[in-house]
């Protein structure tokens, strides 16, 4: 759909005569008839297939035609068409003399024709006017013409319909070729799809208007890229919704059981070393000079047994003093007055030089001890059995009878309760002083993680159209994360797509 526009500019008829040569009385009151039709190699009479238009009397004999388009007048002349512009045309322009006021063809004498011109050719749609001038023996007509598209029609042939809109059916303006140009923030074939906030997660986020990012169930954050952990999850994270994966040092269904008391509470004082030994349980290894559960008590300096070779320690205001046994001297009784050459070892002990002869050490036979093998051994006096084991003297040797849960020569080894993998369903086992503890994965509880605490609501595949299913552990229900184009609690309804031409 478009308009053929013809702008008459000047008509010259100096002698004021008709085509027959007869003069007009008193002058040629001139009006024009225009016929637009399909292309003909030789323009012939016949129907004006593209349309006709007539003007009122525009002047007498010779005159210039005023441009009346701004004032709602009839110049340029409009010849609308409701078809694809073919690119070629034929045009006939007749100038007539009007003796009276009735300009209808049947009301005029046949010899009222002043002049007739006929042209044909090709014409592309465009804003530019083509200027032409036709001259006969008695007259001259200067005019210009063009073809433009009607409102909302575009393209080389005015065949593409495009009407800008900003509503539910689309958000666009039209390009010169008739293609849609989406308004900022919209995309898609008909510019119906909003462009979400930059970075908004493709699957976990969506939007109903531009620069928005609304999260699907189980997701949060400005870009919907953070999963929501299980309700009540204390010291844990998630990689998919409703999970509770415990941070290091935490256990339990809600990651609220402290397995790393040392790091979280730093209970050991005075530079002591802390070791975790179960839930909310720890052991402090004190530095010399300190004691107490948390190494909070300062020891007497002698409590660290600084005196060597059987020296006895005496506390003093400014420290301590070692009273050395006979044969030893030095701050810690670390030096000997004798060497192996003096045969210092008793009871058949063998002497070994140390520090290039500055010291010696006695290697005692069984049943003897002391720096110089001077003491007979009671093998149980040193309480060699650990963890409450009972020491039994057996002649030259001794034996430890261990309490349940301990083993080894000195009952020093803890029999691991975890060795037999007692925790079910992938639970983590922790050896404690008086037994064991299982840290259960999400969905299981009980002393050995044997109780399933939640039903997998996703097991029955309740979500349609390839939606992702998540189990909400707090309610034992499922949540469907719909792909683009589907809605509903099970993603069962397709979003209504627009018709091919929504206008």
């Amino acid at each position: 759909s478009g308009v053929f526009q013809l702008q008459l500019q000047e008509f010259i008829n100096e002698r004021g005569v008709l085509a027959s040569g007869r003069p007009c009385e008193p002058g040629c009151r001139t009006f024009f008839r225009v016929c637009l039709k399909h292309f003909q190699a030789v323009v012939s009479p016949g129907p004006c297939t593209f349309g006709t238009v007539s003007t009122p009397v525009l002047g007498t004999n010779s005159f210039a035609v005023r441009d009346d388009s701004s004032g709602g007048g009839r110049n340029p002349l409009q010849l609308p068409f409701n078809f694809t512009w073919p690119g070629t045309f034929s045009l006939i322009i007749e100038a007539w003399h009007a003796p009276g006021d009735d300009l209808r063809p049947e009301a005029l004498p046949p010899d009222a024709l002043i002049s007739k011109i006929a042209i044909q050719g090709s014409l592309a749609v465009g804003q530019n006017w083509l200027l032409d001038e036709q001259t006969s023996t008695l007259t001259r007509l200067r005019y210009s013409y063009r073809v433009i598209c009607s409102d909302n029609y575009y393209g080389d042939n005015c065949s593409r319909l495009c009407k800008k809109r900003n509503d539910h059916f689309g958000h666009y303006v039209c390009q010169p070729d008739g293609n849609l140009s989406c308004l900022p923030g919209w995309t898609g074939e008909y510019c119906q799809q909003p462009i979400c906030l930059s970075g908004c997660h493709e699957q976990n986020g969506y939007c109903s208007k531009p620069a928005e990012c609304l999260c699907r169930p189980g997701w949060q954050g400005r870009l919907c890229n953070e999963c929501i952990p299980h309700n009540g999850c204390r010291h844990g994270t998630c990689s998919t919704p409703w999970q509770c994966t415990c941070d290091e040092g935490w256990g339990g269904l809600f990651c609220d059981q402290d397995l790393n008391y040392c790091t979280h509470h730093s209970p050991c004082k005075n530079g002591a070393t802390c070791s975790n030994s179960g839930q909310r349980s720890y052991t402090c290894t004190c530095r010399p000079g300190y004691t107490g559960v948390d190494c909070e008590l300062e020891l007497s300096e002698c409590d660290s047994n600084p005196c060597r070779n059987g020296g006895s320690c005496k506390d003093q205001e400014d420290g301590y003093h070692c009273l050395c046994p006979p044969g030893y001297y030095g701050l810690h009784c670390e030096h000997s007055t004798l060497s192996c050459a003096d045969s210092p070892c008793f009871n058949g002990g063998s002497c070994r030089e140390r520090n290039q002869g500055a010291n010696y050490a006695c290697e005692c036979p069984p049943n003897f001890t002391g720096s110089n093998c001077e003491k007979k051994v009671d093998r149980c006096t040193s309480n060699p059995c650990a963890n409450g084991g009972q020491c039994l003297n057996r002649g030259p040797s001794r034996m430890c009878r261990c309490r349940p849960g301990f083993t080894g020569t000195y009952c020093e080894l803890h029999v691991s309760d975890c060795a037999r993998n007692p925790c079910a369903h992938g639970g983590t086992c922790h050896d404690l002083e008086n037994g064991l503890m299982c840290t259960c994965p999400a969905g299981f509880s009980g002393r050995r993680c044997e109780v399933r605490t939640s039903i997998d609501a996703c097991a029955s595949s309740p979500c349609f159209n390839r939606a992702t299913c998540y189990t909400d552990l707090s309610t034992d229900t499922f949540v469907c994360n719909c792909p683009y184009g589907f809605v509903g609690s099970r993603c069962e309804f397709p979003v209504g797509l627009p018709p091919s031409f929504p206008w």
Epitope: P326, G327, L338, S339, A341, D342, N347, E374
Partner: nanobody, 119 residues
Amino acid sequence: EVQLVESGGGLVQAGGSLRLSCAASGDIPRIAAMGWYRQAPGKQRELVATVSNAATTRYADSAKGRFTISRDNAKTVSLQMDNLKPEDTGVYYCYSLATTVTPSWVNYWGQGTQVTVSS
């Protein structure tokens, strides 16, 4: 029981010399070593020098290079002290390291002799 008698102490100028002697008497068991300890005022008794039957000698760091210990025989010991300093002042005790009837080592001590070094 062993008795130890010291001699040779006295007052001396800094840089001077003294010679201490000690003799053991009485029911003498096996003596393995003899030597000298010093007790400065307000301080603990500390070893100065010792020599064993096998001629093993030990010196305190402060005595090295200035003092010389020697065993004249099994029952006597001497300490030659040269280039004396004020910090060498104190009571010098002779001692002997000996065995008893029950096999172990025992220290026997003398009464002590005063050494005073003036500056």
